[in-house]
């Protein structure tokens, strides 16, 4: 086999702005961000990242993961809860370009979804979304 | 159709699974008009510990 499992497959939404994987640097004040490489190894949270080009990311050290007995969701030591969300968009058609973050279709849909979640969860507790994946319905 | 899977992050203690789903479902009509996204089949769950791409994407990696 050859090649490498890579490609930006994450976005970070924070403080009312959408940091698209392909354009905008992630805020360094953000308590977390998600590595953009969509790889075959488990992804953990990096303390911050700096986007440098279309789909590569440089990461700082990974903070320790901790569990808590009094929470409904796992957290980092920074006190973050995570939720997995899945839904169908019935008026859109899947195509292969949704597997690649450098394509226009991927970027446009990712941007709309990121903006939508900022609208939905306006309250102060929302930190962001990550690891967006599209597949056929 | 397109299935979207993602992870949401919140400050600890500010929201639970039920409220995440409720707020999302309440926004579906506006999503259709504002973003032209017709949303259905919403599912929300806690990310299993330890946090990883493999676990929260149901081993899609």
């Amino acid at each position: 086999a050859s090649g490498s499992a890579s490609g930006s497959a994450s976005t970070l939404v924070h403080n009312g702005t959408s940091a698209r994987a392909t354009t905008t640097p992630a805020s360094k004040s953000t308590p977390f961000s998600i590595p953009s490489h969509h790889s075959d190894t488990p992804t953990t949270l990096a303390s911050h990242s700096t986007k440098t080009d279309a789909s590569s990311t440089h990461h700082s050290s990974v903070p320790p993961l901790t569990s808590s007995n009094h929470s409904t969701s796992p957290q980092l030591s920074t006190g973050v809860s995570f939720f997995f969300l899945s839904f169908h968009i019935s008026n859109l058609q899947f195509n292969s370009s949704l597997e690649d973050p450098s394509t226009d279709y991927y970027q446009e849909l990712q941007r709309d979804i990121s903006e939508m979640f900022l609208q939905i969860y306006k309250q102060g507790g929302f930190l962001g979304l990550s690891n967006i994946k599209f597949r056929p319905g | 159709s397109v299935v979207v899977q993602l992870t949401l992050a919140f400050r600890e203690g500010t929201i639970n699974v039920h409220d995440v789903e409720t707020q999302f479902n309440q926004y579906k009509t506006e999503a259709a008009s504002r973003y032209n996204l017709t949303i259905s089949d919403v599912s929300v769950s806690d990310v299993p510990f330890p946090f990883s791409a493999q676990s929260h994407h149901h081993h899609h990696h």
């Epitope: 090649g3 279309a54 690649d100 973050p101 450098s102 | -």
Partner: antibody, heavy 117, light 107 residues
């Protein structure tokens, strides 16, 4: 380690069909798409089509529509490319290439299909 | 269909040389271009994705860039293992298409 292992070389007569397999290991099979590409002797690369594994979603190059069928068997972690009504100009090495967060990330070793009477 | 015109079709170079291969796209493809390496009897290997991003495990002497509709693969200092054929690939729109290839040979 991610691997795409393709089936062995085939010799077929004109008018026959060939089915090339691409077995995936090292990752969960239903997560990604597979593209199929061919290379005729001494020529460049030509895209045939795409299948999202574990679904019936496919895309085809118009040039091959009606002659090529892409399928997958999730239980066997294998994708298949079947080309029918073979002619001599279909003699080529056929490759599968998987996505991994981006397209064409990993490639199989190729399968030589020879069409000869 | 989008045409990718790759040049040169072949080149002879020595170890240590700087090598540049260019692909020109007939339509706007944004950054949706990969560079592939093919060696006889080996699986094709992707070197660069999304115009300029280096795949993991690929030596840093390989780099990709874009100027308008021209896309460039540069090998800053050619090594013995770099003698191969290189292809560009666009995935902006279906059908996905490839450049004609550049064979890098030993001078």
């Amino acid at each position: 380690e991610v691997q795409l292992v393709q089936s062995g070389a085939e010799v077929k007569k004109p008018g026959a069909s060939v089915k090339v397999s691409c077995k995936a290991s090292g990752y969960t099979f239903t997560s990604y798409g597979i593209n199929w590409v061919r290379q005729r002797p001494g020529q460049g690369l030509e895209w045939i089509g795409y299948i999202y594994l574990g679904s019936d979603y496919t895309e085809y190059n118009e040039k091959f529509k009606g002659r090529v069928t892409l399928t997958s068997d999730t239980s066997a972690s294998t994708a298949y490319m079947e080309l029918s009504s073979l002619r001599s100009e279909d003699t080529a090495v056929y490759y599968c290439a998987r996505s991994a967060g981006s397209l064409f990330a990993y490639w199989g070793q190729g399968t030589l299909v020879t069409v000869s009477s | 269909d989008i045409q990718l015109t790759q040049s040169p079709s072949s080149l002879s170079a020595s170890v240590g040389d700087r090598v540049t291969i260019t692909c020109r796209a007939s339509q706007d493809i944004g950054i949706t271009l990969n560079w592939l390496q093919q060696k006889p009897g080996k699986a094709i290997k992707r070197l660069i994705y999304a115009t300029s991003s280096l795949d993991s495990g690929v030596p840093s002497r390989f780099s990709g860039s874009r100027s308008g509709s021209d896309y460039t693969l540069t090998i800053s200092s050619l090594q013995p293992e770099d003698f191969a054929t290189y292809y560009c690939l666009q995935y902006a729109s279906s059908p996905y298409t490839f450049g004609g290839g550049t064979k890098v040979e030993i001078k």
